[in-house]
């Protein structure tokens, strides 16, 4: 793992005054265990809309590491195999919580933070706009 | 807000001895005040591979609601708007992390959850298997 | 259109054994994590096995670990239940159907199999 050096501002563990702060124990419990993480590992190629996934890091976010859904087309695959631009490949995106250290570089010390990522891509009617 | 009532038995937030405990501060930072939380409310209707919103709440976790996805149907919508069964509606998954308070009904004190959500629904080529 | 048919169950004594079996037709059966879902009288409809696209894992109601074990055969487009060391508590009428965890499957629901379990 990378080594965050120390910030010397860094709030004390103990301070009664730090804002709206809670305890938060890092050992992850993972309620997964009863799935099977490669059942959806081949959609993103596999879809009508297609996606390809890149690799977001951040070493000051836990999770460090992030990946991001992006379409490959604007439409979406045909029976065919082409690219059918009467349809549109659209990012299925979903708020989720990280942690964000704050301040900087401070190893036992996160603020809550939301941000947004794309999850994979679906692929949808288009809104036809009528011109009069 | 649900009220948690205080278990006698919560660590006290100063405890040095808390396993891999970490500050965190609960004001929330959110980074997407750029995006249209909108732009993608109506996909789960227009999908070739729509889905349903459940919500799931739970007053132990940190975000206490998550809307979890349920795809409508086995097959796909084709351009008749009928259910194609030779194709698949599958959904994209994603394991998040999540606050859960423990000892329960702590108001200061949570570990780190790993859980899998459904965010929405894709449609996928099936995988055929050839039998001899 | 999606067809989900149940057969196997009866009466058994406890301690017995029975071997459900449920045909799927009208969807590719090899693309779906399968289950079996059981209702008794004046309960609601809960989840008992669960068995993953290929068979590659299971996933058991603590209520039957270790007794029951769901399997599948995709050539068959069939999903098997087999209850050992049945109790009175195991009586309900059992179903299959896709994974209601990730589905609306409400519109499949096929007929069930009786399973009595008398002491």
């Known amino acids: 793992g990378i080594t965050i050096p120390r910030n010397p501002g860094c709030p004390n563990s103990e301070d009664k005054n730090f804002p709206r702060t809670v305890m938060v124990n890092l050992n992850i419990h993972n309620r997964n265990t009863n799935t099977n993480p490669k059942r959806s590992s081949d959609y993103y190629n596999r879809s009508t809309s297609p996606w390809n996934l890149h690799r977001n890091e951040d070493p000051e976010r836990y999770p460090s590491v992030i990946w991001e859904a992006k379409c490959r087309h604007l439409g979406c695959i045909n029976a065919d195999g082409n690219v059918d631009y009467h349809m549109n490949s659209v990012p299925i995106q979903q708020e989720i919580l990280v942690l964000r250290r704050e301040p900087p570089h401070c190893p036992n010390s996160f603020r809550l933070e939301k941000i947004l990522v794309s999850v994979g891509c679906t692929c949808v009617t288009p809104i036809v706009h009528h011109v009069a | 807000g649900i009220t948690i009532p205080r278990n006698p038995g919560c660590p006290n937030s100063e405890d040095k001895n808390f396993p891999r405990t970490v500050m965190v501060n609960l004001n929330i930072h959110n980074r997407n005040t750029n995006t249209n939380p909108k732009r993608s409310s109506d996909y789960y209707n227009r999908s070739t591979s729509p889905w349903n919103l459940h919500r799931n709440e739970d007053p132990e976790r940190y975000p206490s609601v998550i809307w979890e996805a349920k795809c409508r149907h086995l097959g796909c919508i084709n351009a008749d708007g009928n259910v194609d069964y030779h194709m698949n509606s599958v959904p994209i998954q994603q394991e998040i992390l999540v606050l859960r308070r423990e000892p329960p009904h702590c108001p200061n004190s949570f570990r780190l959850e790993k859980i899998l959500v459904s965010v929405g629904c894709t449609c996928v080529t099936p995988i055929v298997h050839h039998v001899a | 259109e999606v067809q989900l048919v149940e057969s196997g169950g009866g009466l058994v004594q406890s301690g017995g054994s029975l071997r459900l079996s449920c045909a799927a037709s009208?969807?590719?059966?090899?693309?779906?994590?399968m289950s079996w879902y059981r209702q008794a009288p004046g309960k609601e409809r809960e989840l008992v096995a669960t068995?993953?696209?290929?068979?590659?894992?299971?996933n058991y109601a603590d209520s039957v670990k270790g007794r029951f074990t769901i399997s599948r055969d995709d050539a068959k487009n069939t999903v098997y239940l087999q209850m050992n060391s049945l109790k009175p508590e195991d009586t309900a009428v059992y179903y299959c159907?896709?994974?209601?965890?990730?589905?609306?499957?409400?519109?499949?629901w096929g007929q069930g199999t009786q399973v009595t379990v008398s002491s």
């Open positions: 159907n896709v994974d209601w965890k990730w589905y609306e499957v409400d519109d499949y």
């Open positions: 068995v993953e696209i290929g068979g590659s894992s299971t």
């Open positions: 009208g969807f590719t059966f090899s693309s779906y994590a």
